[in-house]
Amino acid sequence: MAVTACQGLGFVVSLIGIAGIIAATCMDQWSTQDLYNNPVTAVFNYQGLWRSCVRESSGFTECRGYFTLLGLPAMLQAVRALMIVGIVLGAIGLLVSIFALKCIRIGSMEDSAKANMTLTSGIMFIVSGLCAIAGVSVFANMLVTNFWMSTANMYTGMGGMVQTVQTRYTFGAALFVGWVAGGLTLIGGVMMCIACRGLAPEETNYKAVSYHASGHSVAYKPGGFKASTGFGSNTKNKKIYDGGARTEDEVQSYPSKHDYV
């Protein structure tokens, strides 16, 4: 039950995170005009990964797409790439994790297959979250660098009689959405990986176990031990060796209230 809950929660958290990454990628407010210590302008500038916008005090907003590809800064291209990779990996991860969910039964899928799928989706979510966090952080770093450069220009370029309004940009809402969404996707991925450990079938738990016969210091493999003691047929006793895994009865694919959505 705890495994199902962990897996389900991991899926939901990742789903919210990926939705957030998509939202952040599409948002126009990656950088917004810094209003502090600036003349109050009748226009408000803000920029996204795909277009820049100007909102006038009249209420009109005009957005222009970045129609050039080669003319864009390499950093912006890198951020775009990171966000898209994050979305693609996250989307594939979601698709895989749907089939891996313990509460959904597809044919006679083995638990080992579900465990592998859960682990795969978990890793995908972790990489997706890291991509989003990296993308947003690169953009934020770019903003900070440009902010201080333009601040320096503001105070060095005052020699002439005519003043120019230097538009400085600060963190936009999309950055915070991206950071939170990336974090959620990462957490969801970790939860899926944790759930995977609980989903792993019991047989795998025997391989690393050594059994010591009383009075002998000989290690037996499970197969050989089964023949001499009869423990192999009494599957109820598996609990002795199993660090919390389920009994064979629990693994059987009988329909239960958890099997269908």
């Epitope: 109050v40 009748a42 226009v43 100007v54 009249s58 222009r64 003043q163 309004v165």
Partner: antibody, heavy 117, light 113 residues
């Protein structure tokens, strides 16, 4: 069609508050911002302030402590209040609709306000 | 506050001739976000409210004759009437629409010779 009409008392005593109303038709105040501009006789134009679609305002810093702009979207009316008036506030007061580039594409005919005792 | 200056204060031009009015601002009116200059030109005839001619320094308002054109960028702007007509006699104002307060120029009176 788009129309703006200013109204209010033509005569105000010094130190009193000047109150004007701009009634608009042909458009909604939820879609367009409104600006107030005044013009003393034979002189130039002076921007007083504006009220945005969401109700936010910005005023001329020279008059900031005295000027106040508000609106009633349902009645399609914008209000200008100028407190502690003096003879220097005698002018024709216009309201105008903000358009592209924060320019005023439609103006009212203006209302003449005289400050005198 | 941004100071707007216009030159000349008044000008007399022959009918059909070109009329030019200049406007200078104390700060740049160019918005880097969209590379547009936030300056407007108005025409005011006696006893009438001002009428918008040009916005964004060079965009003609709908219904304005194409003999009116605006140019310039940053701090220096020009309103040109390519062929002066009798109905163009008026006072012309430029306005800063970029930095608050949105100041107007003192006006240029245009008359026919």
């Amino acid at each position: 069609q788009v129309q703006l009409q200013e109204s209010g008392p033509g005569l105000v005593k010094p130190s009193q508050t000047l109150s004007l109303t701009c009634t608009v038709s042909g458009f909604s105040l939820t879609s367009y911002a409104i600006s107030w501009v005044r013009q003393p006789a034979g002189k130039g134009l002076e921007w007083l302030g504006e009220i945005w679609t969401g109700g936010g305002t910005n005023y001329n810093s020279a008059l900031k402590s005295r000027v106040s702009i508000s609106k009633d979207n349902s009645k399609s009316q914008v209000f200008l209040k100028l407190s502690s008036v003096t003879a220097a506030d005698t002018a024709r007061y216009y309201c105008g609709r903000l358009s592209y580039g924060n320019s005023l594409d439609y103006w009212g005919q203006g209302t003449l306000v005289t400050v005198s005792s | 506050d941004i100071v707007m200056t216009q030159s000349p204060d008044s000008t007399t031009v022959l009918l059909g001739e070109r009329a030019t009015i200049n406007c200078k601002s104390s700060q740049s009116l160019l918005n880097s976000g969209n590379q547009k200059n936030y300056l407007a030109w108005y025409q005011q005839k006696p006893g009438q409210p001002p009428k918008l001619l040009i916005y964004w320094a060079s965009t003609r308002e709908s219904g304005v004759p194409d003999r009116f054109s605006g140019s310039g960028s940053g701090t220096d702007f020009t309103l040109t009437i390519s062929s002066l007509q009798a109905e163009d006699v008026a006072v012309y104002y430029c306005q800063n629409n970029f930095i608050y307060p949105l100041t107007f120029g003192p006006g240029t009176k245009l008359e026919i010779k």
